[in-house]
Amino acid sequence: AVDLTLLANLRLTDPQRFFLTCVSGEAGAGRGSDAWGPPLLLEKDDRIVRTPPGPPLRLARNGSHQVTLRGFSKPSDLVGVFSCVGGAGARRTRVIYVHNSPGAHLLPDKVTHTVNKGDTAVLSARVHKEKQTDVIWKSNGSYFYTLDWHEAQDGRFLLQLPNVQPPSSGIYSATYLEASPLGSAFFRLIVRGCGAGRWGPGCTKECPGCLHGGVCHDHDGECVCPPGFTGTRCEQACREGRFGQSCQEQCPGISGCRGLTFCLPDPYGCSCGSGWRGSQCQEACAPGHFGADCRLQCQCQNGGTCDRFSGCVCPSGWHGVHCEKSDRIPQILNMASELEFNLETMPRINCAAAGNPFPVRGSIELRKPDGTVLLSTKAIVEPEKTTAEFEVPRLVLADSGFWECRVSTSGGQDSRRFKVNVKVPPVPLAAPRLLTKQSRQLVVSPLVSFSGDGPISTVRLHYRPQDSTMDWSTIVVDPSENVTLMNLRPKTGYSVRVQLSRPGEGGEGAWGPPTLMTTDCPEPLLQPWLEGWHVEGTDRLRVSWSLPLVPGPLVGDGFLLRLWDGTRGQERRENVSSPQARTALLTGLTPGTHYQLDVQLYHCTLLGPASPPAHVLLPPSGPPAPRHLHAQALSDSEIQLTWKHPEALPGPISKYVVEVQVAGGAGDPLWIDVDRPEETSTIIRGLNASTRYLFRMRASIQGLGDWSNTVEESTLGNGLQAEGPVQESRAAEEGLDQ
């Protein structure tokens, strides 16, 4: 069973001091939400017993193995069902605690009832505050049964449940009609899946005979031991104030386990700690009684004395539960109550015995669960004991169960049963996950679900290039960490597989399924530099750059230009997807902005070194567009343009710029400056005859303004081919200014 204990502190004078603690003795318990250890969960279960809403309860984790619930503000907060969930995978287990109000109308004589399949369960609700109304019994919150108030027997209402079956398990309550549900008596009925002393799928297997009030688990045949007892059959008492499957936990506080209720995995349920009894576990056992809830009687013989925590303490020369065995009778010594081996291993098991006459090698034998008897291969004889060593044949799963070491001499015999757990080495069910990749390394998460048994002690990652026949490379990692595979080849597919191991000899599992992980491209190493740039408008910038000349092919897919606007804290990125490109036009920029500009080569997703940055100031946005632009052909080589000044000018115009382009032509347009801003007409000369031209213009103050509308006009025919257009304003002729 899972080593999980739910502790309830029942010192109820002040609900604010009440707390519930869930303690796990499991390896890796509560470590987090990964595959190796789901967290401990501790919560109030409001599905059956609903209490008025109050402030939320506080959950505090004390390390990975303990979680505590506090923050109860009033007694009604305590009433109901609490559960703790722990353990991983198929071993995930829920432990349940049912809390009754001490001031309820009805109180349970006993809260937890563990019964065998087919038994009759009797739930007894004691009248604490009488009401002359019927008593309603509910099962898991649903109406179940009615008793008239006249039916109380000795101040108790009894619910008899004959021939119970596992589905009858659950939370039962007895409530006076019309009374608050918080005044109910709440019970927990646990019905084992088998009849008394049996376990297993068809209830065909015999329980080990749990001692000291331990309960045989109907699924795995293990004894769930009461708090304060340990061993395969709960044969060993812990020291006072200790609990847990290996007595590894200590009760908090100076008064030990007084006032604590212990709840353990089903089918045990809840009880006081060893040596204590009563509804609040505050009463010490009466003389002659011991154990959880003081349910056990000592009946010590041969001068043994009764200890309320451990039972009979035997005088020298005697041993046994009741000090009934003489030390002359042979005795198995210090046999571990539980051993764990991995599947298909051939372990050695030792069994030591003492007695008078002294046991010899042939007098000690080992019996497997299927009845096979193994004889020891050698024995070590020491003055106080003989230790027989058994070589066990290759283990199979069917060897899991209770083995028995038996010693027989003329003085008598002794046997000790112990549990052997044959564990299946873990095998990953999925491939590892790729987290990040670079050109020469892969970062991999090996955490995958697995079949077989944990805990995971080591994780091996095997990898080699895809389609390679070379040996696998192996790296051993911590189970909870991601792995970096280094010194790989760029742009190469690798087959990667996980192998998990559990503790012990033969704990290595088979390799998991492979997955293909590909390293990234090599990083581009060349650093470009910015050749130059020029402003083509208030929001346009043409940039050119170069690369160093190196032998061999260029490693790169293109360029990334970055413009940083420090004032606004904004970055603009422009992707140039050709590695041959050496120029780019950046548009849509913000006029009047100071930019930092750089360029870098990229390859796949990797960026090379950035060029040294350049600082570029875009001119502020210019004036509005000139209005009513009009073109009029004057000859076969001249066209006159007229316009009106822009409206709402922010300042004096420094010049106009005219753009001239042959209609339908593929060449770049020509820009001509009109340096006399007061003019409203100009003549463009040197044009070709019978040719259709497009014109538009804009004004400049500090920066170039918006373009005007475009106008079309054709020169007159039959002229000679001109050398190219020039401009003449009304006042004077100007030379061509491109």
Epitope: T133, D148, E151, Q160, L177
Partner: antibody, heavy 118, light 108 residues
Framework: EVQLLESGGGLVQPGGSLRLSCAAS???????VMWWVRQAPGKGLEWVS????????VYADSVKGRFTISRDNSKNTLYLQMNSLRAEDTAVYYC????????????WGQGTLVTVSS | DIQMTQSPGTLSLSPGERATLSCRAS???????LAWYQQKPGQAPRLLIY???SRATGIPDRFSGSGSGTDFTLTISRLEPEDFAVYYC?????????FGQGTKVEIK
């Protein structure tokens, strides 16, 4: 679906006896209080007797000592043994199932007529 | 014994009208223990209301119950043709379990 089916009614002479049965189905019979209610011709309803899951029984004063209610949980059947019958016992006898918590009779059989006459 | 008195004895109404039936107990009855039943000629009674105001399964919401102590009321907000029947109240608080004498709701 809950069903209650009464049987055993008929004509009987004063002083005679009859045993009524009520076969129940569609619910967990052993968990519920069961009742007998009667209705004399043209009159209102009169509660007769009840039996709790535990076997505890209750009777109206008018039938106490003459009628016995019982149940057989293994057969899901309710009984009413009527002895020393009188003319005023003439009625349709209904068996009824309790809603739970003895709050009301939520299902009724169709009734069986008992006539006591010489 | 607790006497349950219903009024009126007969209520003559038309379909669509509102019906208000009264039930008075000779001593205080817990509201958890007051139920109303409907009975049509030749049929077994049918549970309408329990706990004074809770509708039984399948009962239309035009039926409602109210009251506490000694005075309880059954209201049918809008009479349908199938609602014309005899209605009984019943107390479950004391032995014996007693019914009212019934109120007949007939078509006017």
């Amino acid at each position: 679906e809950v069903q209650l089916l009464e049987s055993g009614g008929g004509l009987v002479q004063p002083g005679g006896s009859l045993r009524l049965s009520c076969a129940a189905s569609g619910f967990t019979f052993s968990h519920y209080v069961m009742w007998w209610v009667r209705q004399a011709p043209g009159k209102g309803l009169e509660w007769v007797s009840g039996i709790y899951p535990s076997g505890w029984t209750v009777y109206a004063d008018s039938v106490k000592g003459r009628f016995t209610i019982s149940r057989d949980n293994s057969k899901n059947t309710l009984y009413l043994q009527m002895n020393s019958l009188r003319a005023e016992d003439t009625a349709v006898y209904y068996c009824a199932k309790d809603l739970g918590g003895t709050r009301a009779f939520d299902y009724w059989g169709q009734g069986t007529l008992v006539t006591v006459s010489s | 014994d607790i006497q349950m008195t219903q009024s009126p004895g007969t209520l003559s109404l038309s379909p669509g009208e509102r019906a208000t039936l009264s039930c008075r107990a000779s001593q205080s009855v817990s509201s958890s223990y007051l139920a109303w039943y409907q009975q049509k000629p030749g049929q077994a009674p049918r549970l309408l209301i329990y706990g004074a105001s809770s509708r039984a399964t399948g009962i239309p919401d035009r039926f409602s119950g109210s009251g506490s102590g000694t005075d309880f009321t059954l209201t049918i907000s809008r009479l349908e043709p199938e609602d014309f029947a005899v209605y009984y109240c019943q107390q479950r608080g004391n032995w014996p379990r007693t019914f009212g004498q019934g109120t007949k709701v007939e078509i006017k």
